[in-house]
């Protein structure tokens, strides 16, 4: 199809060679007067659409993406030729950075329902450049964490070295939807909830005497819990004595709850105390039996092939530890009567 009638948008992706980052292109279709498919014009940030970057009753996935080869060859279907580029509804996700992503990307409706739709397309000229050393050394990361329940902020990586006063107007999107009230280079979150996580995109316009282009950065925001302030607690065994039958096999389970730590090095082990001696027992590997956002429960068993009289004089101690401290729980075996 003839792409000369497509509206054109120029974008710049400056990527950091130090970190993994992603990039997105929105199928930002214009609105020819009589087209029913391209259901929106460029929106001012005051107009909040239901969906961004695409509106209308049509299925949001009803767009086709192409790349225009620089050598003038026919347009290539993105899905067939570029495994590192994923189409999700109206958005094109670039999973890996690199100058080889530079080029012209065209999107248009899959279904051409009227002659007007032929010109309903947008051509995005993407320039991809590695960040130069002269760029800001402490630019914000493309992966940012927000602490649940606290105050936090999301910074636009390409503008994080500029003060709020000198920063240009920024357009923010979250999961493809326009955040109409956000215009600065930083989004401040008064209280962080789990719904604040997602893919944020910040755009601002740069221009020289010849042309203008959109500088875009993508930020993956995670919501996390803060590191625990507590040492682990032992959930099992609860009792300090255990009735057993002599000569029978026995498994004692130690289950301990460890609070969340970003650097997580849990210790869970069994040792035996016999009068003045104590030694660690080589027991099966510890295994995680539950994982939540706030904590992890780890289990480690001690297995006795058969309980002997000597075992009744010993104490079996489960020892657990994290970066805050340690906890122990000892179990004394007692012969079952009758």
């Amino acid at each position: 199809f003839n792409i000369s009638g497509c509206s054109t948008k120029k974008l710049l992706w400056t990527y950091s060679t130090r970190s993994e980052e992603e990039f997105v292109l929105f199928c930002d279709l214009p609105e020819p007067q009589k087209s029913h498919f391209c259901h929106r014009n460029r929106l001012s940030p005051k107009q909040v659409p239901e969906h961004l970057p695409f509106m209308g009753s049509n299925d949001l996935s009803d767009v086709q993406w192409y790349q225009q080869p620089s050598n003038g060859d026919p347009l290539e279907d993105i899905r067939k030729s570029y495994p590192h580029i994923i189409q999700d509804k109206c958005t094109l996700h670039f999973l890996t950075p690199g100058v080889n992503n530079s080029g012209s990307y065209i999107c248009r409706p899959k279904m051409i329902k009227s002659p007007y739709d032929v010109a309903c397309c947008v051509k995005m000229i993407l320039e991809v450049k590695p960040q130069t050393n002269a760029s800001c050394e402490y630019s914000a990361s493309h992966k940012q964490d927000l602490l649940l329940g606290s105050t936090g902020s999301i910074s636009c990586p390409s503008l994080s070295c500029q003060s709020d006063a000198q920063s240009p107007a920024v357009t923010w999107y979250k999961n493809g939807k326009l955040l109409s009230v956000e215009r600065s280079n930083r989004i401040v979150v008064d209280e962080v909830y789990d719904y604040h996580q997602g893919t944020y995109v910040c755009d601002y316009t740069q221009s020289d005497t010849v042309s203008s282009w959109t500088v875009r950065a993508v930020v993956q925001v995670r919501t996390i819990v803060g590191d625990t302030k507590l040492k682990p607690d032992i959930l099992d065994p609860v009792e300090d004595t255990l009735e057993v039958e002599l000569g029978k096999p026995l498994t004692i389970s130690c289950k301990a709850r460890f609070g969340f730590e970003r650097v997580f090095n849990p210790v869970i082990k069994w040792y035996i105390k016999d009068s003045d001696l104590e030694w660690e027992v080589s027991v099966p590997e510890a295994k995680s039996i539950k994982s939540t956002l706030k904590d992890e429960i780890i289990e480690r068993n001690i297995i006795l092939e058969k309980v002997t009289q000597r075992d009744l004089r010993r104490k079996f101690v489960c020892f657990v530890q994290n970066s805050i401290g340690n906890t122990t729980q000892s179990v004394q075996l007692k012969e079952k009567r009758g």
Partner: antibody, heavy 115, light 111 residues
Framework: SVEESGGRLVTPGTPLTLTCTVS????????LGWVRQAPGKGLEYIGY?????SAYYATWVNGRFTISKTSTTVDLKMTSLTAADTATYFC?????????????WGPGTLVTVSS | AAVLTQTPSPVSAAVGGTVSISCQSS????????LAWFQQKPGQPPKLLIY???TLASGVPSRFKGSGSGTQFTLTISDVQCDDAATYYC???????????FGGGTEVVVK
């Protein structure tokens, strides 16, 4: 959003992988679980994959199913399928605490096991 | 594995009335409160109503109330509406996730 795919008619014993594709959800801060429902029956919990990538399964699974993930998908690999595994398979996102409050569900994908 | 036993189906309720569904667990749920309630209508995926035994999920009307602790839990629907006709499930979570599971479901019929 979350959406399941890969459900189809298979013969007993044929392995099958279902995929749950997420968008706008960071799997490094959300657990994602699988639940199934046989026609006309109740919900059955299969298991979940934690934010750190560890998988946890209901006792009845007994090693037949495996849950794994990439940054945007969670797979449920099923082996030794029998007619009893015929069901709609749902994936569900949990962001509250790890594995107990599935607050966002996909529409489900139907798996039929029949000779 | 833990067993979750729900009120047998069906349970009838009159519009504007109150209905209660119980869920009993054979083991104590994690933290005494790791129990969730779901509503499911034919042809739809389940919808979360209550988590943490008593916390109302986002967007759920306050007519739905969860209570209980340990092994015994109840979902109460007050001022029942026609739209509440559905099957309700409890989901328990335990110290070991391998014990996690749903109750058998309770169908609520609204008259």
């Amino acid at each position: 959003s979350v959406e399941e795919s890969g459900g189809r008619l298979v013969t007993p014993g044929t392995p099958l992988t279902l995929t749950c594709t997420v968008s706008g959800i960071d799997l490094s801060s959300n657990a994602l679980g699988w639940v199934r429902q046989a026609p006309g029956k109740g919900l059955e919990y299969i298991g979940y994959i934690s934010t750190g990538g560890s998988a946890y399964y209901a006792t009845w699974v007994n090693g037949r199913f495996t849950i794994s993930k990439t940054s945007t998908t969670v797979d449920l690999k099923m082996t030794s399928l029998t007619a009893a595994d015929t069901a709609t398979y749902f994936c569900a996102r949990d962001s509250y605490a790890g594995d107990y409050a599935f607050n966002l569900w996909g529409p489900g994908t139907l798996v039929t096991v029949s000779s | 594995a833990a067993v979750l036993t729900q009120t047998p189906s069906p349970v009838s309720a009159a519009v504007g009335g109150t209905v209660s569904i119980s869920c009993q667990s054979s083991k104590t749920v994690y933290n005494n409160n790791w129990l969730a309630w779901f509503q499911q209508k034919p042809g739809q995926p389940p919808k979360l109503l209550i988590y943490g035994a008593s916390t109302l999920a986002s967007g759920v009307p306050s007519r739905f109330k969860g209570s209980g602790s340990g092994t015994q839990f109840t979902l109460t629907i007050s001022d029942v509406q026609c739209d509440d006709a559905a099957t309700y499930y409890c989901l328990g979570s335990y110290i070991s996730s391998s014990d996690n599971g749903f109750g058998g479901g309770t169908e609520v019929v609204v008259k």
